[in-house]
Amino acid sequence: VPRWRQQWSGPGTTKRFPETVLARCVKYTEIHPEMRHVDCQSVWDAFKGAFISKHPCNITEEDYQPLMKLGTQTVPCNKILLWSRIKDLAHQFTQVQRDMFTLEDTLLGYLADDLTWCGEFNTSKINYQSCPDWRKDCSNNPVSVFWKTVSRRFAEAACDVVHVMLNGSRSKIFDKNSTFGSVEVHNLQPEKVQTLEAWVIHGGREDSRDLCQDPTIKELESIISKRNIQFSCKNIYRPDKFLQCVKNPEDSSCTSEI
């Protein structure tokens, strides 16, 4: 008789999840020699231990603490780039501007980027059929709790000027319900962070509006100011040119506004 299995609303665990996490860990240590002390088998064991045999709607930040400890990493606190709804451009930027870091440029972020995972209460099985959806099922699921945990720690580590890339093509350029709006903004430390600088990325070729005047940006400014952190905002009218100018700053066309 087939065993009854909870059917969740979200997609199941990414195929080859254990192999992918382990391979990514080794790749990360190959790319970043300063992380060669990391034991990737232990990292996978700690990752697995955070959600295996646990109800996938009852995961806590505490469950991830062994993994957080193993993945401890020092990134330059004044070189942090946060992003919201514009991951690809943020990653293209840090690929060129090698001294800046998104969360996915750290070991733990790199391990989990674009993956889904969950287990089942009281069995050691990984659920490849379905996992809880944040809205339709529960917020304390393995994926959401992981990103909340690592995002909080990442924001807490930031200092001096923190940059955030925002998607100017969205109806809510700043969304209070995004990970940036609900976690990172509230965990920047006013005693360490002097300024949050928002880069609003324009989508349209002919879009010359000042999106820094958008009501949601004003809302972000208000939240940040109330936390005793200065706020500044820049329009990035031409993201393609912006990246090109980061690559080749001496290019003559890079003196004009981008």
Epitope: T20, A23, V26, K27, E30, I31, P33, R36
Partner: antibody, heavy 120, light 107 residues
Framework: EVQLVQSGAEVKKPGATVKISCKVS????????MHWVQQAPGKGLEWMGW????????DYAEKFQGRVTITADTSTDTAYMELSSLRSEDTAVYYC?????????????WGQGTLVTVSS | DIQLTQSPSFLSASVGDRVTITCRAS??????LAWYQQKPGKAPKLLIY???SLADGVPSRFSGSGSGTEFTLTISSLQPEDFATYYC?????????FGQGTKLEIK
């Protein structure tokens, strides 16, 4: 069985661009970093750069920076190395190589090499 | 960049001899060193990784030792198929670098 199979020999004129392919089989392409190594005739080995095929992230040796582009096509499990503004000193055998994850970060697997001759 | 200096550059020896090749690093690379064998027209073959671990399928007459800045590759009893060029490589830091090579010839 892990295999890295490179494209055939090329003859190019100075100033031209060459693009060499490295098709892999026997493992999951995105699970490993791919490196490229140059060996000029009668000379030693020189590391050129790496790519993470999963994300397309790259890093290049300063000597080749600006002239080399490493790419990966995950739909065909193929890595590419493109070298532009060719000069006679670029005449060499080019290898793709990867580690085994169990052998430190030494290159346990190599392509057979591609000879590029730059001559006017 | 980390410089690796191999010595000697050329070495003549006979079948059955014990030979030692040295690789000196310009800074501490811990045990992050590999040794390769290369024959004419062929790709290099990994012999030793992590300074002293034997790669799969490599005969036990090959051994590596050392850490920090001084490393050696030893072939305990030369076989005819061992006449080739040997390279050390550091993977402690990017850019990865190789020694200039040691050509082992039949005396």
């Amino acid at each position: 069985e892990v295999q890295l199979v490179q494209s055939g020999a090329e003859v190019k004129k100075p100033g031209a661009t060459v693009k060499i392919s490295c098709k892999v089989s026997g493992y999951t392409f995105t699970d490993y970093i791919m490196h490229w190594v140059q060996q000029a005739p009668g000379k030693g080995l020189e590391w050129m750069g790496w790519i993470d095929p999963e994300y397309g992230r790259t890093d290049y040796a300063e000597k080749f920076q600006g002239r080399v582009t490493i790419t990966a096509d995950t739909s065909t499990d193929t890595a590419y190395m493109e070298l532009s503004s060719l000069r006679s000193e670029d005449t060499a055998v080019y290898y793709c190589a990867r580690s085994a994850h169990t052998t430190g970060f030494g290159f346990a697997y190599w392509g057979q090499g591609t000879l590029v001759t730059v001559s006017s | 960049d980390i410089q690796l200096t191999q010595s000697p550059s050329f070495l003549s020896a006979s079948v059955g001899d014990r030979v030692t090749i040295t690789c000196r690093a310009s800074e501490d690379i811990y045990s992050n060193l590999a040794w390769y064998q290369q024959k004419p027209g062929k790709a290099p073959k990994l012999l030793i990784y992590d300074a002293n671990s034997l790669a799969d399928g490599v005969p036990s007459r090959f051994s590596g030792s050392g850490s920090g800045t001084e490393f050696t590759l030893t072939i305990s009893s030369l076989q005819p198929e061992d006449f080739a060029t040997y390279y050390c490589q550091q993977y402690n830091n990017y850019p990865y670098t190789f020694g200039q090579g040691t050509k082992l010839e039949i005396k």
